[in-house]
Amino acid sequence: IWELKKDVYVVELDWYPDAPGEMVVLTCDTPEEDGITWTLDQSSEVLGSGKTLTIQVKEFGDAGQYTCHKGGEVLSHSLLLLHKKEDGIWSTDILKDQKEPKNKTFLRCEAKNYSGRFTCWWLTTISTDLTFSVKSSRGSSDPQGVTCGAATLSAERVRGDNKEYEYSVECQEDSACPAAEESLPIEVMVDAVHKLKYENYTSSFFIRDIIKPDPPKNLQLKPLKNSRQVEVSWEYPDTWSTPHSYFSLTFCVQVQGKSKREKKDRVFTDKTSATVICRKNASISVRAQDRYYSSSWSEWASVPCS
Amino acid sequence: RNLPVATPDPGMFPCLHHSQNLLRAVSNMLQKARQTLEFYPCTSEEIDHEDITKDKTSTVEACLPLELTKNESCLNSRETSFITNGSCLASRKTSFMMALCLSSIYEDLKMYQVEFKTMNAKLLMDPKRQIFLDQNMLAVIDELMQALNFNSETVPQKSSLEEPDFYKTKIKLCILLHAFRIRAVTIDRVMSYLNAS
């Protein structure tokens, strides 16, 4: 048993049929010695008396808010949560496996630049009685500070019969140098509590590996005289690290017909313009990627050819 | 159509082209190592990230772009040099700061070159003959060092009398390649920045 926060405790349980329960001794936080009784949750029934209560925790029915009282007055509370371990593996019932980039990916994180700011998100089908708490650091043995905000519900989607909820959190490394070469990964830890179930999820990454630039901005077409060709120009996204000559991007320019089956023409360039043939009803899209470290491509920025 | 990026004009900043070749070569070598050594811990998640140049050179700090010198986190509580305008020891007068940056890059390359050559000698002794260092990568390191045109003491190749542990050598190779790739990215950024200056 360990303390998650004040008056909230996590009991770690081996979850197999013939596992013995965990013996827990609850102590009433009071100088009083006599006349103390204990209750659980909304029930007014007395479960025991005395300054301590020894219980066996084996089921979710044994978890909950234990309260000690004296003469009708509440003295203190202890909320017990359960963390299940099945076949030596901690349960992951609360969050959905996103399976990208690999199986057992519950947290996904992205950064728009090298400033040390990043966003993580996760999915669940649970809509109520759910809380998240996020902590992060650079390295684990001698951790350096990363500050994370509160996790918020960022999207709701319908997937077949189920509703899916996306939560996200923004974090910022306390003293980040965009030019630094990372040798210690960022660690992100999410505590998830659903009713009386506790789970924790972790992700470890280097900022350089989760970079995904915003799409190029100000995408414009300039027709070339007496030609089917157009000059496409764009700019670096505002959110990209500066100076751009140091943090350079490379670009992919794509000409796509109306039909998805039509052949796509693609050009790769380090410049912020390119000359392409603009077909009728086609659209031109441009995306960006770090020129020197191949992490994710940005989403496409698009303009119609017309 | 997949059109490759155009190569820089010969008249451009002389080291840019070499640094781009270096990054390409080390990235290819790392990819080859990860495929060949698929049952070894060779991915970024599995290896320990060690920097053999740590406390010996200070390339990141010495080559910091002017715009980032206002960022206290980049100064890392050291006496930091930063690069100003100039070229890769070409005809224009090179500032002291810039020379410090480029000499730091040169020292990095020299250290990695020695490590890679020592490692290759060990790998050539492996009866499995599983993996060797790409000669192209070693050549590209050499070319960039020549372009930087520094004269410094030649570091003797490390020789070891004991029987090599090939498993450990291959893991060390992965660690070295990951670290060198990160340094090659920094070098490329620096050269790109200098080219624009």
Epitope: Q42, S43, T54, I55, Q56, G61 | -
Partner: antibody, heavy 119, light 107 residues
Framework: EVQLVQSGAEVKKPGESLKISCQSS????????IGWVRQMPGQGLEWIGI????????RYNPMFRGQVTMSVDKSSSTAYLQWSSLKASDTAMYYC????????????WGQGTMVTVSS | EIVLTQSPATLSASPGERATISCRAS??????LAWYQQKPGQAPRSLIY???NLQSGIPARFSGSGSGTDFTLTISSLEPEDFAVYYC?????????FGQGTRLEIK
């Protein structure tokens, strides 16, 4: 006052189905799991299993798994034990009981339902 | 599963006497053992839980002791209403199991 009131005695033929009930009152139904115990004529007590009234989480005694089904209706604070195809060997007194949280034993019991299966 | 063996199977005693019933587990159950009383035609009633804790409303003449594998239920001075069948139950490991019962009869 805590009370567990069970449905009346049943006489059934082999192969028939049956569902007996246990209605709880006088306490917070969702705080306490409900269990079932069998007592064959002239015999001792046998633990069938327990279930959560909150989310129908169930723990069966392997000996009874597949033989009986436990269920619960939160809205009426009622627990059920059912058989899809009775056998003569199911003849017994069945007790529902309230599981004490933080312990696991049964602190309050229903009066029992006698089930007789005979052709 | 854990087997609980009660002894004796039948105990003859007179009102006012002290009665002791033993319950032995085939493996340790810690302190997670309860005692129940069952009278003819009635449901069992909880007497003792966690080996030695008296259930609310049960007279103080009933007491329990033991831990691990050996447990004892003691009735310090028998009253006429105490003559019944007594069962021990372990609730440490699933499936929870009962002893075969001890019949306490009037001598």
């Amino acid at each position: 006052e805590v009370q567990l009131v069970q449905s009346g005695a049943e006489v059934k033929k082999p192969g028939e189905s049956l569902k007996i009930s246990c209605q709880s009152s006088g306490y917070s139904f969702t705080t306490y799991w409900i269990g079932w115990v069998r007592q064959m004529p002239g015999q001792g007590l046998e633990w069938i299993g327990i279930m959560s009234p909150v989310d129908s989480d169930i723990r069966y005694n392997p000996m009874f798994r597949g033989q009986v089904t436990m269920s619960v209706d939160k809205s009426s604070s009622t627990a059920y034990l059912q058989w899809s195809s009775l056998k003569a060997s199911d003849t017994a007194m069945y007790y529902c009981a309230r599981r004490r949280p933080g312990q696991g034993y049964f602190d309050f019991w229903g009066q029992g339902t006698m089930v007789t299966v005979s052709s | 599963e854990i087997v609980l063996t009660q002894s004796p199977a039948t105990l003859s005693a007179s009102p006012g006497e002290r009665a002791t019933i033993s319950c032995r587990a085939s493996q340790s159950v810690g302190s997670w053992l309860a005692w129940y009383q069952q009278k003819p035609g009635q449901a069992p009633r909880s007497l003792i839980y966690a080996a030695s804790n008296l259930q609310s409303g049960i007279p103080a003449r009933f007491s329990g002791s033991g831990s691990g594998t050996d447990f004892t239920l003691t009735i310090s001075s028998l009253e006429p209403e105490d003559f019944a069948v007594y069962y021990c139950q372990q609730y440490n490991i699933y499936p929870y199991t009962f002893g075969q019962g001890t019949r306490l009869e009037i001598k």
